[in-house]
């Protein structure tokens, strides 16, 4: 997959890293009425690497049934791959204005907690 | 639920804080043989107030289906509830030997990312 | 090795309608948002089309939209564009062309190119 | 729509000089730029990715700065096979333009 020399996608996919997609500026949910594509970069990935000796204990316990999280808040057992930096993101709204929100998109990602 | 005066349960349940169970120290996946129980601190709960501009975002693509992440690896849309402290845990081993492992308990939380 | 192929050009009539189609070989088809730009005779590049992995978003410029539908098949690994109400500035080569990194990492950056196919619109 | 403009239109060079081309948006674009060459009769070509990035299997004499709304090609030894029109794009923002090229020809 890919052009020659391009990574696998698994193993692309796998680690905390900073994505890019393309989304209509009417889903960012910012009010603005606008029928564009806008690249949105966001966080995602693993950040297993990265557990304390807490989070290798408390992936143990959920693991075995041992620990009884509170309903509907189950406790996370690694650090979480999160936004370090912001960027704005500017497009253009159905009356043809550019429209500029700040902070509203990633531009660098970390292990976290 | 709870005595006169108390919160709600699910409330109690639903911010980010530290939590308390008693385990068993076998499943705490440390390698030491233990018929112990002891006291683990953990943190859970949402840290939907701490949201960012990106994160009101985020979670609107993904409500929206806007946003296709990568496989197994669905993005974060809120900080998350972290232990910010630690403390060490005691307890007996099956040879009547105390052992300390620093760092294995929560004693603080927070909204971290 | 990465491969694709447009067809479906021609000469067509002003206000008919054209279908072109583009197989892809050497990458996994449904990974991959894929895009249709064509280039009229001596003049520069345009983008006229732009479909995501799955199909779920589609998007076209002024110039072409209400006439033009992008489709695709990743079943059969072959890009479509669907072509009305043809006008004689939409004559031109259709590129086919594939984003170079994976859905959830595109940048919009266009690494692999058909040769294209030829359309004119001639009374 | 975001407007791209290329200066120059057009160019004449020797083989090993070094050349830059700019490519200017209407608007920001954040990185969302790049550079493709396209040789008569045959499809454009990716060169440079996202402002900077090298395209597997392109030279390292090509290479590609700016941000925002300003940026920049360069060739920095002039190559036989480099003679071509140049193009830069913006993939930010829907439509996704093209600037309008710049020829680069034996001088």
């Known amino acids: 997959a890919g052009g020659p020399g391009s990574r696998p996608r698994a193993a692309g996919a796998r680690g905390c890293r900073l994505r890019s997609q393309l989304v209509p500026v009417r889903a960012l949910g910012l009010g603005h009425r606008s029928d564009e594509l806008v690249r949105f970069r966001f966080c995602s990935g693993s950040c297993r690497r990265a557990r304390s000796p807490h989070d290798l204990s408390l992936a143990s316990l959920l693991g075995a049934g041992a620990l009884r999280p509170p309903p509907g808040s189950r406790p996370i057992s690694q650090p979480c791959c999160r936004p370090t930096r912001y960027e704005a993101v500017s497009f253009m709204d159905v009356n043809s204005t550019w429209r500029t929100v700040d902070r509203l998109s990633a531009t660098a990602c970390g292990c976290l907690g | 639920a709870g005595g006169p005066g108390s919160r709600p349960r699910a409330a109690g349940a639903r911010g980010c804080r530290l939590r308390s169970q008693l385990v068993p120290v076998r499943a705490l996946g440390l390698g030491h043989r233990s018929d112990e129980l002891v006291r683990f601190r953990f943190c859970s709960g949402s840290c939907r107030r701490a949201r960012s501009p990106h994160d009101l975002s985020l979670a609107s693509l993904l409500g929206a289906g806007a946003l296709r992440p990568p496989p197994g690896s669905r993005p974060i849309s809120q900080p998350c509830c972290r232990p910010t402290r630690y403390e060490a845990v005691s307890f007996m081993d099956v040879n009547s030997t105390w052992r300390t492992v620093d760092r294995l308990s929560a004693t603080a939380c927070g909204c971290l990312g | 090795q990465v491969q694709l192929v447009e067809s479906g050009g021609g000469v067509v009539q002003p206000g008919r309608s054209l279908r072109l189609s583009c197989e892809a070989s050497?990458?996994?088809?449904?990974?991959?948002?894929l895009h249709w730009v064509r280039q009229a005779p001596g003049k520069g590049l345009e983008w006229v089309a732009f479909?995501?992995?799955?199909?779920?978003?589609?998007y076209y410029p002024k110039s072409v939209k209400g006439r033009f539908s992008i489709s695709r098949d990743n079943s059969k690994n072959t890009l479509y564009l669907q072509m009305n109400s043809l006008r004689a500035e939409d004559t031109a080569v259709y590129h086919c062309t594939k984003e170079r990194d994976y859905y959830y990492d595109s940048s919009g950056s266009l690494d692999y190119w058909g040769q294209g196919t030829l359309v004119t619109v001639s009374s | 729509d975001i407007q791209m403009t290329q200066s120059p239109s057009s160019l004449s060079a020797s083989v090993g000089d070094r050349v830059t081309i700019t490519c200017r948006a209407s608007?920001?674009?954040?990185?969302?730029l790049n550079w493709y060459q396209q040789k008569p009769g045959k499809a454009p070509k990716l060169l440079i990715y996202t402002t900077s990035g090298l395209q597997s299997g392109v030279p390292s004499r090509f290479s590609g700065r700016g941000s925002g709304t300003d940026f920049t090609l360069a060739i920095s030894s002039l190559q036989p096979e480099d003679f071509a029109t140049y193009y830069c794009q913006q993939s930010y923002h829907s439509p996704f333009t093209f600037g309008p090229g710049t020829k680069v020809d034996i001088k």
């Open positions: 050497g990458f996994t088809f449904s990974d991959y948002d």
């Open positions: 608007q920001t674009i954040n990185n969302y």
């Open positions: 479909i995501s992995n799955d199909g779920s978003n589609e």
